[in-house]
């Protein structure tokens, strides 16, 4: 051994005076002379290029050129390689350590608040985590020991900049302004792209990113790359930030972050970001299912392991709250799956943002920006081919769950593209093949990862999917600071935490309700309505008397038809009253002269055959509502394509007479005739199917007014369409929220545990062109159309100013989980 040592460069690297066995040398020139000792390459050269220790390096003489040190004094000097303790001192590595040793929070002296590390791996789709888990031991360990979701939903469009900035602001792209990687703002008259300096203009970046939220509340923040971190947002940069340079090795990024954690307490940040370009780069180049992606996953896993090992070396591995996530997923694209605009237009006289989430605007901007006829473009792209692989939308008509409309940068024409397809201008575009993203955020291929570990997080837990707008509030809770206003629902991720910091409570009702009292069984004004079936005033009196419920009957109908409580009204100054019926309850909005909501429970019926037809041509005044607050039947005669629909379907009756409880003006809402076809099919066929499958469903439905398409209920003066020129407004959408018991052995009104929700927000349009229904029966298109417009209960709440489930005996944070849940039916990736 002694002889071997004498022939070794160990501790002798670049020492010009050293002469080893057989006169071997370890100086800089030995390679030129050819007299290097046997281990010169491994011990001296390789050591300056690697970020790890090994048996050659342990105890090495400090090398100026090395990236990190394995010398005996490196711990004091704070420049050890991340794995020094495990390789050179025989400690158990983080990877080998048992999860169970991480039971209690272990923060060293000076770490009063557990630091938060937000780590993004671009384009890491959720499926990779399950398919390639054995190739990613470090990430897999984090998944096993910490908490993870089945997936995290990206926001639309599922692109890098919009989603990274959403994660750190809690805002939808329409709210924070970064609506795509490429965009035009007519007010700035500038173009934003990832390749131009313009991206660093603060005018593009709205909202308050996490680093500023932390800094405004006395904490320091450090970003090792993150979209927006090099921009003087609101005039400020993060406390520490790095100018973006994609060629910085991942190990160098990790090493720098670890050095920031070594800073003295007064200088040390509490919040950190880390960004890796992989596996996105490889996914684009070769597609998601490729050797290149597998290699990239191994690379990022190794670098992540270096971080965890470095944390362990500092005894921070059970002190730091680390969140590992992605911005979006990845899908395969093909050069034979291209939609060309030249197939739809004789000439392309518009500008198109091409790809998986295309937008179309005027070519000549700013001059033609506002006068560009978007409606005409959408018309020319609608229902043109039987196998069309995109659906054109005016952005206000996009599914509301996307929240992708209210920003001047979001061009009015939008193409919703099928998975794996691309929509481009012409065949001159050959940017296809490999992988891409940007598609519908419900596609499984677009799902992103979310894993977390640390003293604040629960351990060994898998949670249901959630949306990335919720992460900002979560990080604020981890840092015990107040979030800026955002689109997340604070408290909805409390189930990820051992001890939640924020305790949510139900919203206070803003507008009190009254009860529309029953005074007289005969109306003072028949509102131009007719019901030939009620041939005299005695019959009319009889059916109207049915609307006069006793207190016992009110209690009974509330128990069955409002099992989770009455929706609370959070809009200001809304004069509303409750209307009780044996089979439904509704909240009547006096200013709008229509029900704001109607609630009823459909039991599990014996058979699933469609409902019988409603009594035809029979409508009458509701004697509980003054004529001045009611619609009139005559309103509907003047507007040919507007008819009336019923919120509570009269055909769902339990007795032959009870149908008359629904054939009243207070149950009426204006509907386009084409829309009503879908509405009626839903209630007579699909609703019965749902009730049968779920052991009964509670239904709450009602109108929505969002003419300014901002995702929030409109002020009355913002409403632009009215029936027959009266002040009866025409809704922009209708909502339907189906609620059943998760445990299907219970009915909705006797549900002890979790609820299941299926909310729809259906655009109310004069035609069904969105479904290209020509010559097709409703069975072929209605369900597909409704599924496209599934939303969260929270989306319904924002659009209506109502608040649901307040009387459900369940912790509020669990109710918020329910409200932020988005049902999905995507099965294939």
């Amino acid at each position: 051994r002694k002889l071997e040592k004498q022939g070794s460069c160990r501790k002798k690297c670049f020492d010009a005076s050293f002469r080893g066995l057989e006169n071997c040398r370890c100086d800089v020139a030995c390679e030129d002379r050819g007299d290097c000792c046997w281990d010169f390459e491994d011990t001296c050269v390789e050591s300056t290029r690697i970020w790890t220790c090994n048996k050659f390096r342990c105890g090495e003489t400090r090398l100026e050129a090395s990236l990190c040190s394995c010398s005996d004094d490196c711990l004091q000097r704070k420049d050890c390689c991340a794995d020094y303790k495990s390789v050179c001192q025989g400690e158990t590595s983080w990877l080998e350590e048992n999860c169970d040793t991480a039971q209690q929070s272990q923060c060293p002296e000076g770490f009063d608040l557990p630091p938060v590390i937000l780590f993004s791996m671009d384009g890491f789709r959720a499926e990779y985590l399950y398919t390639w888990d054995t190739l990613m031991p470090n990430i897999n360990k984090l998944k096993t020991c910490g908490i993870h979701s089945k997936y995290m939903r990206a926001m639309y469009p599922t692109k890098t900049f919009p989603n990274h900035y959403t994660i750190v602001t809690g805002l939808y792209p329409e709210s924070h302004g970064i609506i795509d990687n490429n965009m035009y703002d007519v007010n700035l008259n500038k173009n934003f792209s990832l390749s131009s300096e313009e991206q660093n203009n603060p005018a593009w970046w709205h909202g308050q990113p996490m680093w500023l939220t932390a800094m405004y509340q006395g904490l320091k923040a450090a970003t090792y790359f993150w979209p927006g971190s090099e921009v003087a947002i609101n005039g400020s940069f993060p406390s520490i930030y790095m100018p973006y340079n994609r060629s910085v090795p991942y190990e160098e990024r990790i090493s720098t972050l670890l050095k920031w954690l070594d800073l003295p307490k007064a200088e040390r940040p509490s919040f950190y970001t880390m960004y890796f370009e992989e596996p996105d780069s490889s996914g684009h180049a070769s597609g998601p299912v490729s050797a290149r992606v597998i290699k990239a996953l191994q690379v990022v896993d190794h670098a992540f392991g270096m971080l965890m090992e470095g944390l362990k070396q500092r005894n921070l591995h059970n002190c730091v709250n680390i969140i590992l996530l992605a911005d979006h997923g990845m899908d395969q694209t093909y050069c034979n799956k291209m939609e060309y605009m030249t197939d739809y237009f004789p000439r392309i006289n518009f500008y198109m943002y091409e790809g998986p989430a295309p937008r179309i605007r005027a070519l000549n901007v700013p001059h033609d920006f506002f006068s560009f006829n978007s409606e005409e473009i959408v018309r020319n792209l609608s229902c043109r081919k039987p196998d069309q692989h995109f659906k054109p939308y005016l952005t206000p008509d996009l599914p509301k769950r996307l929240h992708y409309a209210k920003n001047v940068r979001i061009d009015k024409v939008h193409l919703f593209v099928d998975p794996q397809w691309l929509a481009v201008g012409s065949k001159s575009n050959t940017n296809c093949g490999g992988g891409n993203h940007g598609y519908n955020n419900e596609f499984r291929s677009m799902e992103a990862i979310f894993l977390a570990h640390g003293p604040s997080f629960k351990e060994k837990t898998e949670v249901e999917p959630f949306e990335n707008i919720e992460v900002y509030n979560l990080m604020c809770d981890l840092l015990r600071i107040q979030p800026a206003p955002n689109n997340g629902t604070r408290g909805s991720l409390n189930h990820l935490l051992k001890v939640p910091f924020y305790k949510p409570s139900h919203a206070e009702e803003v507008s009190k309700f009254s009860v529309c009292g029953f005074a007289n069984p005969l109306p003072t004004d028949n509102l131009s309505c007719l019901c030939p079936h009620l041939q005299n005033s005695i019959q009319l009196e009889q059916v109207n008397q049915m609307l006069n419920l006793t207190q016992e009957e009110i209690t009974a109908t509330v128990k069955v038809n409002l099992p989770f409580g009455r929706p609370r009204v959070l809009q200001k100054n809304v004069d509303n009253c409750l209307l009780y019926h044996r089979e439904y309850v509704s909240g009547f909005g006096k200013a709008m002269r229509m029900p704001m909501w109607s609630s009823y429970t459909v039991p599990q019926l014996g058979d699933t055959s469609p409902l019988p037809p409603t009594v035809p041509d029979c409508l009458r005044a509701d004697v509980r509502v003054p004529p001045s607050e009611s619609q009139k039947c005559s309103f509907y005669l003047a507007d040919e394509n507007i008819t009336h629909g019923f919120l509570y379907p009269p055909a769902i009756n339990r007795t032959s007479d009870s149908q008359y409880d629904a054939l009243i003006m207070s149950n009426l809402v204006p509907m386009y005739e084409e829309f009503r076809k879908m509405w009626d099919y839903f209630h007579s066929v699909l609703l019965i199917k749902h009730a049968t499958e779920r052991n009964g469903v509670n239904v709450v439905s009602g109108p929505i007014f969002d003419y300014n398409y901002d995702g929030h209920f409109d002020a009355p003066e913002e409403i632009t369409k009215h029936i027959a020129n009266t002040d009866i407004p025409i809704p922009t959408h209708y909502f339907v929220v189906l609620t059943s018991c998760k445990n299907k052995s219970h009915t909705p009104e006797n549900c002890p545990g979790w609820l299941d929700v299926l909310p729809f927000i259906i655009p109310h349009r004069p035609t069904n062109v969105e479904s290209c229904p020509e010559g097709k029966p409703e069975a072929l298109w209605v369900e597909e159309r409704l599924t496209a417009h599934i939303a969260r209960v929270r989306d319904v709440e924002l659009l209506t100013g109502l608040d649901f489930y307040q009387d459900k005996a369940q912790p509020v944070s669990e109710i918020l989980q329910l409200k932020t849940y988005l049902p999905t039916f995507e099965t294939t990736i």
């Epitope: 978007s374 009355p716 632009t720 009215h722 020129n725 009266t726």
Partner: antibody, heavy 115, light 107 residues
Framework: EVQLVESGGGRVKPGGSLRLSCAAS????????MNWVRQAPGKGLEWVSS????????KYADSVKGRFTMSRDNAKNSLFLQMNSLRDEDMAVYYC????????WGQGTLVTVSS | EIVMTQSPATLSVSPGERATLSCRAS??????LAWYQQKPGLAPRLLIY???TRATGIPARFSGSGSGTEFTLTISSLQSEDFAVYYC?????????FGQGTKVEIK
């Protein structure tokens, strides 16, 4: 038959005030939002103000904001426009019109502003 | 505010001929557009609302089309009583705005 009859026009000095009225009949007044539109001599139409059926909102053109006040009395089927601080450029025929698109108009009342 | 631009300012047409009037909005007004006819000394009269729906009592020779930013009023065969000034107006946004008018005169 729907009828709208304006009154209250006349000659007034700059800085003066006038109150216009519009009497409605032949329809349920409380079902409709109402509007004032004016037309200067030899010029086109200019929207002045709108009020919703139950007065939950009133909207004004920038040119009259802070000077004109629109109101209604549903019990009396009446619409009003209180015009203060009148200017030369306010001289016009003032029409009241029904609904969100103006399906019925009155015959108009002339407001003359001159010193 | 949304600027409504009508063209032409004056249209000279012979009785029995077709007249096509254009109205352009500076930004989309969806289909919330109305057309009015005004004869000298009289109040305007509603012809078309919702861009294409004829108002009560309006003859079938009047038709409206368009949506978004481009709209057209067509009078298929001009009668003597149709010579007047025609205004378009949007009711999609506040403030409500009118076009400057197109005068249809006898050729």
């Amino acid at each position: 038959e729907v009828q709208l009859v304006e009154s209250g026009g006349g000659r007034v000095k700059p800085g003066g005030s006038l109150r216009l009225s519009c009497a409605a009949s032949g329809f349920t007044f409380s079902d409709y939002s109402m509007n004032w539109v004016r037309q200067a001599p030899g010029k086109g139409l200019e929207w002045v103000s709108s009020i919703s059926s139950i007065s939950s909102y009133v909207k004004y053109a920038d040119s009259v904001k802070g000077r004109f006040t629109m109101s209604r009395d549903n019990a009396k089927n009446s619409l009003f426009l209180q015009m203060n601080s009148l200017r030369d450029e306010d001289m016009a025929v003032y029409y009241c019109a029904r609904g969100h698109y103006f399906d019925y108009w009155g015959q108009g009342t002339l407001v003359t502003v001159s010193s | 505010e949304i600027v409504m631009t009508q063209s032409p300012a004056t249209l000279s047409v012979s009785p029995g001929e077709r007249a096509t009037l254009s109205c352009r909005a500076s930004q989309s007004v969806s289909s919330n557009l109305a057309w009015y006819q005004q004869k000298p000394g009289l109040a305007p009269r509603l012809l078309i609302y919702g861009a294409s729906t004829r108002a009560t009592g309006i003859p079938a020779r009047f038709s409206g089309s368009g949506s978004g930013t481009e709209f057209t009023l067509t009078i298929s065969s001009l009668q003597s009583e149709d010579f007047a000034v025609y205004y378009c107006q949007q009711y999609n946004n506040w403030p409500r705005t009118f076009g400057q008018g197109t005068k249809v005169e006898i050729k």
